[in-house]
């Protein structure tokens, strides 16, 4: 089970209308450039076999991957939203740095790996898709971690 006290984000992180709006605007702009609507990264398969108490830990992994492998490499795109949203998400990632799981997290890593593989397989369009799903990442992170 997770060390649940550390796998928590304060509700106030998600009660900032400006940055919430900017995150959703960024997602909307990127989704307009996403021509692969058949694939969804953040959906049922990602959470398959993951208990309620493990959801935040899973979302932490997804957030870190999205920052490091998607947002940082694409940081020059989708301005001015990107320059505001990336530091916000990085702060959330930092606040979850002590969120760990005691015991086996193989099932979680397997699910996250599938998401990573999908993004990598699609190349740049996979990265655009991930940015286009930042609204889902934001909401899923909120729902899992508050």
């Amino acid at each position: 089970a997770p060390i649940s006290s550390h796998c928590r984000l304060d509700k106030s992180n998600f009660q900032q209308p400006y940055i919430t709006n900017r995150t959703f605007m960024l997602a909307k702009e990127a989704s307009l450039a996403d021509n692969n609507t058949d694939v969804r990264l953040i959906g049922e398969k990602l959470f398959h076999g993951v208990s309620m108490s493990e959801r935040c830990y899973l979302m932490k992994q997804v957030l870190n991957f999205t920052l490091e492998e998607v947002l940082f490499p694409q940081s020059d795109r989708f301005q001015p939203y990107m320059q505001e949203v990336v530091p916000f998400l990085a702060r959330l990632s930092n606040r979850l740095s002590t969120c760990h799981i005691e015991g086996d997290d193989l099932h979680i890593q397997r699910n996250v790996q599938k998401l990573k593989d999908t993004v990598k397989k699609l190349g740049e369009s996979g990265e655009i898709k991930a940015i286009g799903e930042l609204d889902l990442l934001f909401m899923s992170l909120r729902n899992a971690c508050i």
């Epitope: 089970a1 509700k11 998600f14 953040i42 959906g43 049922e44 959470f47 398959h48 076999g49 993951v50 208990s51 309620m52 108490s53 959801r55 889902l136 909401m139 899923s140 909120r142 729902n143 899992a144 508050i146």
Partner: antibody
Framework: QSVEESGGRLVTPGTPLTLTCTVS????????MIWVRQAPGEGLEWIGI?????STYYASWAKGRFTISRTSTTVDLKITSPTTGDTATYFC?????????????WGPGTLVTVSS | AVVLTQTASPVSAPVGGTVTIKCQAS??????LAWYQQKPGQPPKLLIY???TLASGVPSRFKGSGSGTEFTLTISDLECADAATYYC??????????????FGGGTEVVVK
């Protein structure tokens, strides 16, 4: 992938009753399951949920009145001491978390009538 | 606990027409709202989640919108088969788990 409830019947007040939800086509080790009830002519009312790891959570009004448990293929709802107000159709449904909880599919329901 | 208030029943419209059902939440639930359709003698059926995402197999005549506290389900090109009661359902996270899932009171749609 389907769920089906059974065990509903006419009982007298105070007589414990256990309803069973049988699942097929998916594993209870991968999905949480919820119980919802609907009194005749009324709306839907969430009772409780059993998570993948066996943890249970109940609506505030349902605590102490209901107990949810499971085996590898079934989820049970025990009505500990039924009253006439517990007369309803009881549904179970699979909880699919997609970043938010959604309930699908639902069983056809089983009718419980509590009367003296 | 969040309270969901739906459009009063019944709402009626002719075949081929459009109906709009509103669902108002007593607190901000972001986009954590789903819509279910229930026909007499049947269980509820998932229509929409994330406030606007169509569930698999649901016709595009069904459209969900809204966020925060105001949500709408619109059914266009009404068919006789759309006659049913529609429920909104919210997920509220971060509070006690004993009030996480809430249903609205339901709105009956009559197709003339």
């Amino acid at each position: 992938q389907s769920v089906e409830e059974s065990g509903g019947r006419l009982v007298t007040p105070g007589t414990p009753l256990t309803l069973t939800c049988t699942v097929s086509g998916f594993s209870l080790s991968s999905y949480a399951m919820i119980w919802v009830r609907q009194a005749p002519g009324e709306g839907l009312e969430w009772i409780g949920i059993i998570d993948i790891d066996g943890s249970t959570y109940y609506a505030s009004w349902a605590k102490g009145r209901f107990t949810i448990s499971r085996t590898s293929t079934t989820v049970d709802l025990k009505i500990t001491s039924p009253t006439t107000g517990d007369t309803a159709t009881y549904f179970c449904a699979r909880d699919r978390f997609v970043g938010v909880d959604i309930f699908d599919p639902w069983g056809p329901g089983t009718l419980v009538t509590v009367s003296s | 606990a969040v309270v969901l208030t739906q459009t009063a029943s019944p709402v009626s419209a002719p075949v081929g027409g459009t109906v709009t059902i509103k669902c108002q939440a007593s607190e901000d639930i972001y986009t954590n709202l789903a819509w279910y359709q229930q026909k007499p003698g049947q269980p509820p059926k998932l229509l929409i989640y994330w406030a606007s995402t169509l569930a698999s197999g649901v016709p595009s005549r069904f459209k969900g919108s809204g966020s925060g506290t105001e949500f709408t389900l619109t059914i266009s090109d009404l068919e006789c088969a759309d006659a049913a009661t529609y429920y909104c359902q919210a997920c509220v996270y971060g509070n006690s788990a004993d009030s996480r899932y809430t249903f609205g009171g339901g709105t009956e749609v009559v197709v003339k």
